[in-house]
Interface confidence: medium
């Protein structure tokens, strides 16, 4: 059961796994949630009645019964992990802790104008987990305005002490705010020869890469496949680091694969959600339970519903035994990964899906799309919304995209002549405009945020945010799309679609059914040749066929140019402008979303 509130002056007795230091009980709860085994925790706040060496300790605990005896203790704050909850969880922590010194390895010291600059430096440094900044009121003159970047093996401080006139905080890499470059490629037949900081067992290089991404010290990895010549190293995932943050050497070796931590673009990739099944593969680990199940899918459900289960192996039923039910072995380990992986025994293995909620909701796989045709089907583009105006009469105004549970991203030019957000209605989960009746539920708009450099669509900055009055509950028919990552400049998108209820030709009317068209991206250089009278800037992106025929048109404005990469959909563009519709050698021009990620995050994450 999900318990979110913290229990003041309460200590859980026993069940200790490990002790870490955190600046607050709230952050202790996050650490517990991300730990593979932690279900409960006890945090000790600063208090005159408590030994200062125990201040800020966060004791992570586990229990077979999912609870522990409670004892009264002043300054103790206890609670439960969010693993038991169904809501979205984020490791992003923007809090600044005043008069606290978070101890770690101080590997970089420099002068900074402010704590914010120090935090930015930490976010853009590959090794940095947290920082301490000495303010200009700090007693020691030579240490004033000094920004100390720190790291530890666990990503959390080794100790926290009170220290006047300093502030501390964490890297904002997990808030999608890092400028570090993302290298998404997995390199076949390659071994990176640098220090190993840890090793785990993984069924494939993709799982190995995800484990590296959420491991605090891992910067890149090498994975030995099941065909690797040395048997004892098969399925071994080596988590690695180096001083420069990059591999010093690439060695060509068959049956090995290597790649990078995607820490700085983790908001747009699944990190915790290993949803694949591994056939003819057995995962070994501590056995939690053995239950009968009809299929490997049913076994995965059982594992997901058992809070302590981390992975499973399903052995299909032998002929007519046990009403056709096989055995479902629910398992766990100290680090969440199998202790050994065996092949050729006929088992089907996989992981719990309980941790999927720790990934950004936008990374969830959506239903397979219908190939061919121009009309969409329900749930095909769950981030697409229709924005209506009610003045003078109600009508479809523009498209938009859900990017957060209270945020729609659209085009600034949609709001020409819109005096107030009160006349706007956002409808989500809609396929046909005819579904919208008087009593159809909608989201009111609390605020329209237009980019302050916007003048007209053709000169750029054609981007706006709508803050909704109420939050969107995510379902299969309404869920967010991922923003592209700032560090992801090497991605070449080849599977891009424009969607909307707009005109099918220049003189037409709004369509009833949501239309879709697959459209190739065009280089800005090529686009500029087609629009000699305009300036195509890097803040714009173009898409279209040379021969025309498929394009966005009037009424599609503000809607998404959605591109799929590695099974995840990204909002690459916002429909902005073009010469006519679907004309030969006149591509559509879209707002290049990656160039506005900072602006979007600044507006949507403002406290």
């Amino acid at each position: 059961e999900c318990v979110t509130q913290l229990l003041k002056d309460t200590c859980f007795e026993g069940g200790d796994i490990t002790t870490v230091f955190t600046p607050s009980a709230k952050y202790c709860q996050v650490v517990c949630t991300y730990h593979p085994r932690c279900l409960l925790f006890t945090f000790t706040a600063e208090s005159p009645s408590e030994d200062p060496t125990r201040w800020f300790t966060c004791v992570l605990k586990d229990s077979v019964t999912e609870t522990l005896p409670r004892v009264n203790r002043t300054a103790a704050i206890s609670g439960y992990s969010f693993k038991q909850c169904s809501h979205q969880i984020s490791a992003c922590n923007k809090d600044i802790y005043v008069d606290l010194d978070m101890k770690g390895i101080n590997y970089n010291s420099s002068v900074a104008k402010s704590a914010q600059e120090c935090q930015e430096r930490c976010t853009d440094d590959v090794h940095c987990h947290f920082f301490t900044y000495a303010t200009r009121q700090f007693p020691s003159l030579e240490h004033r305005n000094i920004c100390l970047l720190k790291h530890t093996q666990t990503g959390t401080p080794t100790r926290i002490t009170k220290l006047d006139k300093v502030v501390s905080g964490f890297s904002l890499k997990s808030c999608a705010l890092s400028n570090l470059a993302c290298i998404r490629d997995i390199f076949p037949n390659t071994v990176f020869a640098d220090s190993n900081i840890d090793s785990v067992m993984a069924p494939d290089a993709f799982v190995c890469g995800r484990i590296c991404t959420h491991h605090p010290g891992c910067l890149f990895f090498t994975f030995f496949s099941q065909e690797w010549p040395k048997e004892s190293q098969r399925n071994l995932c080596l988590l690695k680091t180096s001083e420069s943050g990059l591999p010093s050497t690439r060695i060509k070796k068959s049956k090995a694969l290597s790649g990078f931590s995607l820490q700085s673009c983790r908001h747009s990739i699944p990190v915790f959600c290993h949803s694949s099944f591994y056939h003819d593969t057995d995962f070994l680990g501590e056995e939690l339970d053995i239950v009968a199940a009809k299929s490997h899918e049913a076994c995965q459900k059982l594992c997901t519903n058992a809070v302590r289960c981390q992975f499973f192996t399903y052995t299909p039923a032998q002929a007519s035994c046990n009403e056709g039910k096989g055995k479902c072995y629910l398992k766990l380990s100290s680090n969440g990964s199998p202790t050994k992986i065996l092949h050729g025994r006929g088992g089907i293995s996989g992981y719990t899906l309980r941790l999927c909620k720790m990934d950004n909701e936008c990374t969830t796989k959506i239903k397979p799309r219908i190939v061919g045709g121009t009309a969409s089907v329900r749930g095909e583009w769950p981030w697409q919304v229709t924005l209506h105006t009610t003045s003078p009469t109600q009508r479809h105004l523009c498209g938009g995209s859900i990017i957060g549970n209270q945020w729609i991203l659209t085009a600034a030019h949609c709001f020409y002549g819109v005096e107030s957000p009160k006349i706007l209605r956002v409808y989500s989960g809609i396929l046909n405009q005819s579904e919208i009746k008087e009593d159809t539920s909608f989201f009111g708009v609390q605020e329209i945020i237009i980019h302050d450099q916007y003048k007209m669509a053709e000169s750029g900055y054609d981007i706006a945010l709508l803050k909704l009055e109420t939050t969107v509950n995510y379902t299969d028919s309404q869920r967010p799309i991922c923003l592209p990552s700032k560090g992801d400049r090497n991605v070449i998108y080849t599977d891009c679609w424009v969607t909307g209820w707009g005109y099918r030709k220049l003189r037409d009317k709004i369509q009833n059914t949501l239309q879709k068209a697959k459209i190739p991206l065009v280089t800005n250089e090529e686009c500029q040749k087609r629009y000699r009278g305009h300036k195509i800037t890097h803040k714009m992106i173009c898409a279209g066929y040379r021969e025309g025929g498929k394009d966005a048109c009037k009424g599609d404005s503000g809607g998404p140019l959605s591109c799929k990469h590695n099974e995840v959909w990204h909002l690459v563009g916002i429909t902005s402008w073009g010469e006519g519709c679907a004309q030969r050698e006149r591509p559509g021009v879209y707002t290049n979303v990656v160039e506005y990620v900072d602006w979007i995050l600044e507006k949507t994450q403002a406290v």
Partner: nanobody
Framework: QVQLVESGGGSVQAGGSLRLSCAAS????????MAWFRQAPGKGLEGVSL????????SYTDSVKGRFTISQDNSKNTVYLQMNSLRAEDTAVYYC???????????????WGQGTLVTVSS
């Protein structure tokens, strides 16, 4: 200390090419990455391309993809930026930078060249 010296800038017509060089000297084995940044008149610094010196990983910003190529000659401790199909908006002072991080953030680079001006006229 690391010293960086850029060369190869100049004036060129739109559609033309230039090749910038950045020669590094001094304590160069401390450099994990080298980058080209540019600053157009009245604008901030913009990352153009990155290269990881030991392993050769490369990254480009969207606006130069397919037109610019970064490369290195380890024997000469030199990094190059081959710029083809130049456009008026490529006009800027181009800086070579070296540091330990493979990053688009200028703050991640400890060593900078003096800059070389590239002017593209349409």
């Amino acid at each position: 200390q690391v010293q960086l010296v850029e060369s190869g800038g100049g004036s060129v017509q739109a559609g033309g090419s230039l090749r910038l060089s950045c020669a590094a000297s001094g304590y160069t084995y401390s450099m994990g990455a080298m980058a080209w940044f540019r600053q157009a008149p009245g604008k901030g610094l913009e990352g153009v391309s990155l290269i990881a010196t030991s392993s050769g990983f490369i990254s480009y910003t969207d606006s130069v993809k397919g037109r610019f190529t970064i490369s290195q000659d380890n024997s000469k401790n030199t990094v190059y930026l081959q710029m083809n199909s130049l456009r008026a908006e490529d006009t800027a002072v181009y800086y070579c930078a070296a540091g330990t991080q493979f990053s688009w953030s200028p703050g991640s680079y400890n060593y900078w060249g003096q800059g070389t001006l590239v002017t593209v006229s349409s």
